[in-house]
Interface confidence: low
């Protein structure tokens, strides 16, 4: 999906209002210095591409982020403010669709969410610059 035509201001507002709080809640009990940020992004569409990938694509050691509250909010926000984004989600797997209780948070998932926080901060910062 090409995030170029998203309403970035609206996405920023939703992030600051709600998504950020859920990310921080997920990370509660860990220090920001516990993980090194290895994922970055260069502009707003690129940041959203990386955010979507880290949030919704399962990895071998962290398969369940898509069911978290911050992920559901991210999906709703992208679907609202990125034209046509909803259509790209129609073939999402059953596992992505279902809501299940979170199992024990693995260190790898905490690391991935730490990367997400970094990407979102980068996204906010790029809003201050001319694209």
């Amino acid at each position: 999906y090409d995030f170029t035509n998203c309403d970035f201001q609206k996405i920023e507002a939703d992030y600051l209002r709600t998504i950020s709080k859920d990310l921080i809640t997920y990370m509660s009990g860990t220090k920001s210095t516990d993980f090194n940020n290895t994922v970055s992004c260069s502009n707003r569409p690129h940041c959203l591409t990386e955010i979507q990938s880290l949030t919704f694509n399962p990895t071998p050691r962290c398969a369940s982020l898509a069911k978290e509250m911050f992920a559901r909010k991210t999906k709703a926000t992208l679907a609202l403010w990125c034209p046509g984004y909803s259509e790209t989600q129609i073939n999402a797997t059953q596992a992505m669709k279902k809501r299940r209780k979170r199992k024990v948070t693995t260190n790898k998932c905490l690391e991935q969410v730490s990367q997400l926080l970094g990407l979102w901060r980068r996204f906010i910062r790029t809003l201050l610059k001319k694209q």
């Epitope: 559901r72 909010k73 709703a76 609202l80 259509e87």
Partner: antibody, heavy 122, light 108 residues
Framework: QMQLVESGGGVVQPGRSLRLSCAAS????????MHWVRQAPGKGLEWVAV????????HYADSVKGRFTITRDNSKNTLNLQMNSLRAEDTAVYYC???????????????WGQGTMVTVSS | SYVLTQPPSVSVAPGQTARITCGGN??????VHWYQQKPGQAPVLVVY???DRPSWIPERFSGSNSGNTATLTISRGEAGDEADYYC???????????FGGGTKLTVL
């Protein structure tokens, strides 16, 4: 307890306007998406419109698009539906319903009002 | 636009199991919600997200969803279960909420 109460229904002539209201109580109104759903006499449920929790997004069924406007006042815990250019086929019981904002874009409707009857007839 | 198809009526003997179906193209990829509506009353949510149940709904009500059919199952049917039942999804391609036509459940 959590409650939604609709008002404003009545009999109106075709082409005229009517404004429905829905008063919410017992829950934090400003954090929920809100919908209008209608049911013509003896017929099934038909979704009408949605408004995002903070009013920044609205969407309408094709059958009412351009004629109906959904609004909300979070300071007063009220939802409104302004219905213009009414037609006979708009005759129905109108329900307001809430949906958890973030579960998906349009989640299940977990609380409904009792409905208000709108009759469009000359 | 997306269409949900329900049988107009289903009958069940007291104590037996009733199954109400909701058909739609690849409905298994969507979250399906079910409502019960008794005459003169507002609808009540009985199953959401295919198979989850609100706290106020008895365990006799359950749901499933795969392929092109979602099913609401009511076990040990009672006279009080007589009502119209509606399935509902969100059609993401049109951003519209869609209801099935409704099924009248009769407990014989």
């Amino acid at each position: 307890q959590m409650q939604l109460v609709e008002s404003g229904g009545g009999v109106v002539q075709p082409g005229r306007s009517l404004r429905l209201s829905c008063a919410a109580s017992g829950f934090t109104f400003r954090t929920y998406g809100m919908h209008w759903v209608r049911q013509a006499p003896g017929k099934g449920l038909e979704w009408v419109a949605v408004i995002w929790y903070d009013g920044t997004y609205t969407h309408y069924a094709d059958s009412v698009k351009g004629r109906f406007t959904i609004t909300r006042d979070n300071s007063k815990n009220t939802l409104n539906l302004q219905m213009n250019s009414l037609r006979a086929e708009d005759t129905a019981v109108y329900y307001c319903a809430r949906s958890p904002q973030w579960e998906s874009i349009f989640e299940a409707f977990d609380i409904w009002g009792q409905g208000t009857m709108v009759t469009v007839s000359s | 636009s997306y269409v949900l198809t329900q049988p107009p009526s289903v009958s069940v003997a007291p104590g037996q199991t009733a199954r109400i179906t909701c058909g739609g193209n690849n409905i298994g990829s969507k979250s399906v919600h079910w409502y019960q509506q008794k005459p003169g009353q507002a609808p009540v949510l009985v199953v959401y997200d295919d198979s989850d149940r609100p706290s106020w709904i008895p365990e006799r009500f359950s749901g499933s969803n795969s392929g092109n059919t979602a099913t609401l199952t009511i076990s040990r049917g009672e006279a009080g279960d007589e009502a119209d039942y509606y399935c509902q999804v969100w059609d993401s391609s049109s951003s519209l909420v869609v209801f099935g036509g409704g099924t009248k459940l009769t407990v014989l």
